[in-house]
C-alpha cells in the first residue's frame, strides 16, 4: 500500500525547491525498480516528484490566500513490468498560512450620522476589517480595533469594531468629526500587521439652542398717515440650530397701547412689526413695545434649553404728517328765514389744524352767489332769500391752512330757508264757469279750490268770501266747504244772455297765517242759452267755437 504523511508547504517560501514530503509504496525495497509519477493540477509546474524516490518538491512560491490546497494523484509503476504497483491514489498538499496579509476595511468609506448631545455609550457605527490570512491558523486573522483619532469624543470596542460616543458633542461647536480606526491582526502582538480606515461622523441637529435677538433695542418709525396693517419694520433673532429647529415665532410680549402686532416671515425668519391701530402724532409720538421670540418646535425633553424666551425692546417713533384742517362737525345744518336782508347771519363753521403748529384757517364757499363766509367761519347772506324759489341750499365749505394751502378739507353745509307768510292763497287753476239763462236759484255753478305757495307748519286753511260789493249786489253766492274748497251758487232765478252775457265775481281767499294774507281772485261766469235739460255743455261748445273763429247758428 501507499505510505505518506500529511503534506504541508509553507506559503511564500523564496527557495527554488522546497521538500514537501515523500510518497512511497511499502513494496518499494529501494532497488530503483519503481517509478513514481505525479498527476493533477500543479503537477510538474508547482510540484515535482523524484521518480525514483517519490520525494515531492515545491518548485515555486505559493500563496495560501490564492490557493490553500492542492489535490494531486500519485502513481507507482514497476519499471521491469510496466505495471502499476499500487492503485492510483489522490493526496492533498495543504499550503500552511503565514501572517502576510494586513487587515482591510472593505466597506469604506464609512459615514455615520448621530444626534448632537447624545449620551455616552450611544452607538454610532460598526466598522469591520477583513484579514485574508487563515482564521484557523493561530492569530494571523484575529483582529483588535483601536482608535487612532477621535478621542475624547469616541471609543471603539476592541473586538467588535463598534464605535460609541464617549463624550457629549455640540453640533454648534463642531458639526462633523473624522475618526481613524486601526485594525491589528495577531491580536496586537509583536509582528502584527495593521490597517486603518477613516469614519466621517456627522452630528445631526437637536433643538438645544433657543433663538436670541440680534439687538437688545430696535428703533422703528411709523408715519401717522400709515393705514392699519402697514409693515413698519423688521426685527431678527438668530438660532444656532438649523432646519426645523431654527424655525421661530415672534410675538408681542408687552404693548399696553395695543397698537402694534408682530407676524413671522417663515421664509426669512424675520419678525415683521405691523400697525394694528392708526397712530396720531399729536396724541402720542412714540411707543415702546417688547417682543419675544420662541422656537416653533420644541421637544419636551429639550425644554430645559428654552426656559426663558429672548426678548427685545422696540422704540417706535411716530412721524408727523401735515394733516388737513379738521372741522368740529362732519356737516352743519343752519336755518334762516326767507326775506331777511342781505348780510344776515346764517351760522358759524369751525375747523382747526390738528397739527402741533396750529396754522390759522381760511374758509371759502364753493360756487355760491347767495352766501359768503369770512375767516372766522361766519356764513352770511349776499341776497335776500325766497323760500318759494329755493327752500334748501347745499353748500360746500372749504377750510385751507394759511401756512400750507395744499392742506384742504371740505364739508357739506345745509341751509334751510324757513317760511314766512309772504304769499296769499290763490285759485289753484284758472276757472271759467257757465250758467244757463233758465237757471234756478241755488244752482251750483262751480267748485273752486285754492293753493298757497307758502309752507304751512300745520295744515293750510283757506277762507272763501265774496268781495263786499259782490256780496251786496251779487247774482251769485259762495259757500265755504271748510276743506279748502268752496262752491259758487246762483242767487236768483233766470239770467239774460243779451243783457248780461258775462259776470265777473271777485272772490276773497284768506289763509290762516300770522298775519293772515288775502287775495282777490276773479271768477268769470258766462251766461248760456241752454236746452231744456239745463245743460251748459252746448254753451261751452259754443264758447269753444267762437274762440276758434267759428259762428254757430
Amino acid at each position: 500500500g501507499w505510505v505518506w504523511n500529511q503534506f504541508f508547504v509553507p506559503e511564500e517560501m523564496n527557495t527554488t525547491s522546497h521538500h514537501v514530503g515523500r510518497l512511497r509504496s511499502d513494496l518499494d525495497n529501494g532497488n530503483n525498480s519503481f517509478q513514481y509519477k505525479l498527476l493533477g493540477a500543479g503537477a510538474g509546474s508547482t510540484f515535482i516528484i523524484d521518480e525514483r524516490t517519490g520525494d515531492i518538491y515545491a518548485i515555486e512560491k505559493l500563496d495560501r490566500e490564492e490557493r490553500s490546497l492542492y489535490i494531486l494523484r500519485a502513481q507507482v509503476i514497476d519499471i521491469t513490468t510496466g505495471r502499476a504497483v499500487e492503485p492510483e491514489s489522490e493526496f492533498v498538499i495543504k499550503v500552511s498560512d503565514i501572517n502576510d496579509n494586513e487587515p482591510k476595511f472593505l466597506d469604506e468609506p464609512y459615514e455615520a450620522i448621530v444626534p448632537e448631545m447624545s449620551p455616552e455609550g450611544t452607538l454610532v457605527i460598526q466598522v469591520t476589517a477583513s484579514d485574508a490570512d487563515d482564521p484557523s491558523s493561530g492569530n494571523n486573522a484575529r483582529l483588535l480595533y483601536s482608535l487612532l483619532q477621535g478621542q475624547p469624543y469616541f471609543s471603539v470596542e476592541p473586538t467588535t469594531g463598534v464605535i460609541r460616543i464617549s463624550s457629549k458633542m455640540d453640533r454648534e461647536l463642531q458639526d462633523e468629526y473624522w475618526v481613524i480606526i486601526q485594525a491589528k491582526d495577531m491580536i496586537g502582538q509583536p509582528g502584527a500587521l495593521s490597517g486603518t480606515t477613516s469614519v466621517l461622523i456627522k452630528l445631526s441637529d437637536v433643538n438645544d439652542n433657543k433663538p436670541i435677538f440680534k439687538e437688545s433695542l430696535y428703533r422703528l418709525t411709523v408715519s401717522e398717515s400709515a393705514p392699519t396693517g402697514t409693515s413698519i419694520g423688521t426685527i431678527m433673532a438668530y438660532d444656532n440650530d438649523i432646519g426645523e429647529n431654527a424655525e421661530m415665532d415672534y410675538s408681542i410680549e408687552e404693548d399696553d397701547s395695543q397698537t402694534f402686532d408682530i407676524i413671522t416671515n417663515h421664509e426669512t425668519q424675520e419678525g415683521i412689526v405691523i400697525l394694528k391701530k392708526k397712530v396720531n402724532f399729536e396724541h402720542q409720538n412714540h411707543y415702546g413695545i417688547r417682543a419675544k421670540v420662541k422656537n416653533h418646535h420644541v421637544d419636551k425633553q429639550l425644554m430645559k434649553y428654552h426656559t426663558e424666551a429672548s426678548t427685545t425692546f422696540i422704540k417706535i417713533q411716530v412721524e408727523d404728517v401735515d394733516e388737513p384742517p379738521l372741522f368740529l362737525l362732519p356737516y352743519y345744518i343752519f336755518e334762516i328765514f326767507e326775506e331777511t336782508p342781505q348780510g344776515s347771519f346764517v351760522g358759524v363753521v369751525s375747523a382747526t389744524d390738528p397739527d402741533n403748529r396750529k396754522s390759522p384757517i381760511r374758509y371759502s364757499i364753493t360756487r355760491s352767489k347767495v352766501f359768503n363766509i369770512d375767516d372766522n367761519g361766519t356764513i352770511t347772506t349776499t341776497n335776500s332769500l325766497d323760500r318759494e324759489i329755493s327752500a334748501w341750499y347745499n353748500l360746500s365749505i372749504t377750510a385751507t391752512e394759511k401756512y400750507n394751502i395744499e392742506q384742504i378739507s371740505s364739508i357739506p353745509v345745509y341751509v334751510q330757508v324757513l317760511n314766512i307768510n309772504d304769499h296769499a292763497p290763490e285759485f289753484s287753476q284758472y276757472y271759467e264757469s257757465y250758467v244757463c239763462e233758465n237757471a234756478g236759484s241755488g244752482q251750483v255753478i262751480q267748485t273752486i279750490s285754492a293753493v298757497d305757495r307758502d309752507e304751512s307748519i300745520e295744515e293750510h286753511h283757506f277762507y272763501f268770501n265774496l268781495s263786499v260789493e259782490d256780496t251786496n249786489s251779487s247774482s251769485f253766492t259762495i259757500i265755504d266747504n271748510q276743506d279748502n274748497t268752496a262752491v259758487i251758487l246762483t242767487n236768483r232765478t233766470g239770467f239774460n244772455l243779451q243783457e248780461e252775457p258775462i259776470f265777473y265775481i271777485s272772490i276773497l281767499i284768506a289763509d290762516n297765517g300770522i298775519p293772515s294774507l288775502t287775495s282777490t281772485n276773479t271768477l268769470t261766469i258766462h251766461v248760456c242759452d241752454c236746452d231744456d235739460s239745463g245743460s251748459t255743455q252746448t254753451c261751452q261748445y259754443q264758447e269753444l267755437m267762437l274762440s276758434m273763429g267759428f259762428k254757430t247758428e
Epitope: L217, D256, Q284, N285, Y287, G288, F313, K315, Q317
Partner: antibody, heavy 119, light 107 residues
Framework: QVQLVESGGGVVQPGRSLRLSCAAS????????MHWVRQAPGKGLEWVAV????????YYADSVKGRFTISRDTSKNTLYLQMNSLRAEDTAVYYC????????????WGQGTLVSVSS | EIVLTQSPGTLSLSPGERATLSCRAS???????LAWYHQRPGQAPRLLIY???SRATGIPDRFSGSGSGTDFALTISSLEPEDFAVYYC????????FGQGTKVEIK
Amino acid sequence: QVQLVESGGGVVQPGRSLRLSCAASGFTFSSYDMHWVRQAPGKGLEWVAVISYDGTNEYYADSVKGRFTISRDTSKNTLYLQMNSLRAEDTAVYYCARERYFDWSFDYWGQGTLVSVSS
Amino acid sequence: EIVLTQSPGTLSLSPGERATLSCRASQSVSNTYLAWYHQRPGQAPRLLIYGASSRATGIPDRFSGSGSGTDFALTISSLEPEDFAVYYCQQYSNSWTFGQGTKVEIK
C-alpha cells in the same frame, strides 16, 4: 463713566445767534437719542429739542420751532444747538441730556450752560 | 400738549418723615410713560424714577413711584438731608413736558 459737558453759553443781544455744544464721553454716543432742556432763572424745566441717535429725526418745542436747530457730530461725540433770532424769554440754563436706551426719560444730564439774552 | 400739575408747590418736612408728592396729567399718560427727577440748588436734575415706578440706577429704595393714567405719586419713605430739593415729574407719552416742580424743604 458717562459725562456730558455743555459749552457756548453767554450774553447775547435779542435777534442774534448762539451755538451751544455738548461734549459726550463714557458711552457709545451714536446709540443714544439726545436732548436739550432749559431752565429759566428761578423757573422749572422746559424741554427744547431732541435728535435721534443717527441724526435723521429732530423734534422741537413749539416755543423754539423755526429758530433753533439741533444737530450732532458722531465723529466728535458732540451735540449742538444752533439758536437764531434769540429773544429775552430764551434766557435760561441749557442742559443737554441723554435719553435712556430702553425708555424716553433722561438718565444723564450735563451741568448746564447759561444763555442770557438782553440788550 | 399734556400739562402736568404738581402738588403741593412746597412741602415742609423734617428728616425721617415720609413725603408724598403728587403729579396730575391733563390727559392720560400712555404706558405709564412718566418719570421723576430731583434737582438740588445749582445742580443738574437727576433721574429718580422712570416708567412711573421703576427706580433708576443707583437710586435708594426709599424712593418709590406709583400711579397710572392721569394720577401719579412719588413717595420718599424717610427723608434724608440730601433729599431736600425740587422734584419734577415728566411725561414722555407725547413729546416731553415737565411739571412746575415741588420744593421739599426742611421744616
